[in-house]
């Protein structure tokens, strides 16, 4: 399977809300011994590879923001902790999962990564991630609403896995 990032760049005005999205593509094993762990974190483009570094989003770690379920089941973070930080991650039945950030500030600008771990019990973990940039702008040059820029077909199926 792969992770697609429909949009590689989100440009938003300060104070706006934004929903960053990833999509699980390809055949998904829904067997008893396969489960999925999905999460979000901030990163950088350096070190070993894009998304290998994990930084918190608004002081919440990837552990705080995870979703867990099998296959394409729906799930969302019900954590009060996330909500108090203006964050909510969610997943639907169609392989889409997202993180919503409310009341954006300039400090929210940066690289965001979604991570999907396919846990094949008795075998290994299979990790795939997607990356996208968030730019929060202020002043007269800022857009009135979020503007999203589609990924190229190559970027949207960018895959890094074991």
């Amino acid at each position: 399977f792969k992770v697609a990032t429909p949009y590689s760049l989100y440009v938003c005005p300060e104070g706006q809300n934004v929903t960053l999205t990833c999509r699980l593509l390809g055949p998904v094993d829904k067997g008893h011994d396969v489960t999925f762990y999905k999460t979000w974190y901030r990163s950088s483009r350096g070190e070993v590879q894009t998304c290998s570094e994990r930084r918190p989003i608004r002081n919440l770690t990837f552990q705080d923001l995870h979703l867990h379920h099998g296959g394409h089941q729906a799930a969302n973070t019900s954590h009060d902790l996330a909500q108090r930080h203006g964050l909510e991650s969610a997943s639907d039945h169609h392989g889409n999962f997202s993180i919503t950030m409310r009341n954006l500030t300039l400090l929210d600008s940066g690289l965001y990564c979604c991570l999907v771990v396919e846990i094949r019990h008795h075998h290994s973990e299979h990790r795939v991630h997607g990356a996208m940039e968030l730019q929060v702008q202020t002043g007269k040059d800022a857009p009135s609403n979020c503007v999203v820029y589609p990924s190229s077909s190559q970027d949207s199926e960018n895959i890094t896995a074991a």
Partner: antibody, heavy 117, light 107 residues
């Protein structure tokens, strides 16, 4: 703050079954691997196996024929059974939380189990 | 299974010195490697995961590097509480395996 606490007998006779329980407090047992790891006196660490919150298990092949790990989500506990023990199974046994695509981030304090007649 | 070999077995240093610990894998583990610290009578404590990501609450003097088969844990300036045994652990596949450990002792 999630905490883990091992419990069980500290002395087991050879050929018998070692049974330990780990109680998870301060957090959910969902969405993580719950592992057992052991450390013989003066030696290194050996992963025994895990149970995922869904009930799926995975054991170290070197111990697989003798190991059973189970979970009771209603009690927030998971357990280890190791059959046909010998003196070589004498060790400190740790339970630990293992985060997918990460590492063992929370450990119990460990419980010493001696196999002796 | 993947074998992790740590070197040196013992490292004798003074507080304030830099410690460099090595972990070598028998085959590539990508960057899926963790480091733990263990003091006598205590459980191991997670320091680093995925080769260089510091765990929550771990001081910046601890840093990890490497990918593939060769990894390094560096303690930039040893504090008295850093004298302990350090283990590496791979998670690219199961069974999960640990290195034999490096003891950092006071010189």
């Amino acid at each position: 703050q999630v905490q883990l606490q091992e419990s069980g007998p500290g002395l087991v006779k050879p050929s018998e079954t070692l049974s330990l329980t780990c109680t998870v407090s301060g957090g959910s047992i969902s969405s993580y691997y719950w592992s057992w790891i052991r450390q013989p006196p003066g030696k290194g660490l050996e992963w025994i196996g895990y149970i995922y919150y869904s009930g799926s298990t995975n054991y170290n092949p070197s111990l697989k024929s003798r190991v059973t790990i189970s979970v009771d989500t209603s009690k927030s506990q998971f357990s280890l059974k190791l059959s046909s023990v010998t003196a070589a199974d004498t060790a400190v046994y740790y339970c630990a939380r293992d985060i997918p695509a990460s590492a063992f981030d929370i450990w119990g304090q460990g419980t010493m189990v001696i196999v002796s007649s | 299974e993947i074998v992790l070999t740590q070197s040196p077995a013992t490292l004798s240093l003074s507080p304030g010195e830099r410690a460099t610990l090595s972990c070598r894998a028998s085959q590539s583990v990508s960057y899926y490697l963790a480091w733990y610290q263990q003091k006598p009578g205590q459980a191991p404590r997670l320091l680093i995961y995925d080769a260089f990501n510091r765990a929550t609450g771990i001081p910046a003097r601890f840093s990890g590097s490497g990918s593939g088969t060769d990894f390094t844990l560096t303690i930039s300036s040893l504090e008295p509480e850093d004298f302990a045994v350090y283990y590496c652990q791979q998670r690219i596949n199961w069974p999960l395996t640990f290195g034999g450990g490096t003891k950092v002792e006071i010189k």
